[in-house]
Amino acid sequence: MMTGTIETTGNISAKKGGSVILQCHLSSTMAQVTQVNWEQHDHSLLAIRNAELGWHIYPAFKDRVAPGPGLGLTLQSLTMNDTGEYFCTYHTYPDGTYRGRIFLEVLESSVAEHSARFQIP
């Protein structure tokens, strides 16, 4: 029985040319996490974090993706095309697969600065 839940950073926005951290956290389960896969909206893999072997960043993203912090992922040099859904897929034993969703909106610099100015602290 799958008892775990995934908490994510939810809907986030970031500035074009900037960077953003994608974070997921699996809780409420004793299952062993064997692998965490990070996927983009078009279902292409960005990175794999294996519990014993560490990180594998996919060749197409090596320039713009940095591992961490933790099991999270940092996207750098953001473009407007990076807007969309991102998924963290936790492969666990014996539970199976848990999946979290994050929506990233990449904003033009001026828009991002404007919206940040009016955020509630």
Partner: antibody, heavy 120, light 107 residues
Framework: EVQLQESGPGLVKPSETLSLTCAVS????????WNWIRQPPGKKLEYIGY???????YYNPSLKSRVTISRDTSKNQFSLKLSSVTAADTAVYYC??????????????WGQGTTVTVSS | DIVMTQTPLSLSVTPGQPASISCKAS??????VAWYQQKPGQSPQLMIY???YRYTGVPDRFSGSGSGTDFTLKISRVEAEDVGVYYC?????????FGGGTKVEIK
């Protein structure tokens, strides 16, 4: 260049423990991942498990209760023990290296393989 | 476990002609797929990783493509030295699993 060489008995009796060793040259086993993969006659290649650069292990759940992978860093070798063997464990056993950082789960160096037959 | 199914089981190709091997995953594995070549009497050798990236030293007549559940290994012009068995493998989730192999022969 990385070289791997399997060694161990070619014949094991049912219910006994299969023991194989892989000697690695040209590379330190304290880097990357060191794997055991087997192929029973006429069947698919099957992942048995691996030991990581740090000494952590992963075992295929289908074999987990019977498998132990260990290493001896002073000799630069790693070993496989498979207990309570049956005829179904008859296979060619390969040791292999995996550079996860660069190639993910793709195995980039393989030993020549050693045939193990389980029979009384 | 994810099941990788290869077709055809065997392939007989005239030298200089193209060859294509298919691999189907039982569930979506994105692009976490590798291809290996096993020549007669030898151990498997890595050819392709991440579905479409050629490993060091692999001739450019070999190419990999696909994502999701359907993957293909193509040889643009088969040469005599290409005979052997070709295997696909997924590493999207553990346990990592292999296809049953496709035997390539020369006509």
């Amino acid at each position: 260049e990385v070289q791997l060489q399997e060694s161990g008995p070619g014949l094991v009796k049912p219910s006994e423990t299969l023991s194989l060793t892989c000697a690695v040259s040209g590379y330190s086993i304290t880097s990357d991942s060191w794997n055991w993969i087997r192929q029973p006659p006429g069947k698919k290649l099957e992942y048995i498990g691996y030991i990581s650069y740090s000494g952590n292990t992963y075992y295929n759940p289908s074999l987990k209760s019977r498998v132990t992978i260990s290493r001896d860093t002073s000799k630069n070798q790693f070993s496989l023990k498979l207990s309570s063997v049956t005829a179904a464990d008859t296979a060619v056993y390969y040791c292999a290296r995996l550079d996860f950082s660069n190639y993910g789960g793709a195995v980039d160096y393989w030993g020549q393989g050693t045939t193990v037959t389980v029979s009384s | 476990d994810i099941v990788m199914t290869q077709t055809p089981l065997s392939l007989s190709v005239t030298p200089g002609q193209p060859a294509s091997i298919s691999c189907k995953a039982s569930q979506n594995v994105r692009t976490a797929v590798a291809w290996y070549q096993q020549k007669p009497g030898q151990s498997p050798q890595l050819m392709i990783y991440s579905a479409s990236y050629r490993y060091t030293g692999v001739p450019d007549r070999f190419s990999g493509s696909g994502s999701g559940t359907d993957f293909t290994l193509k040889i643009s012009r088969v040469e005599a030295e290409d005979v052997g068995v070709y295997y696909c493998q997924q590493y999207y989730t553990t346990p990592w699993t292999f296809g049953g192999g496709t035997k390539v022969e020369i006509k």
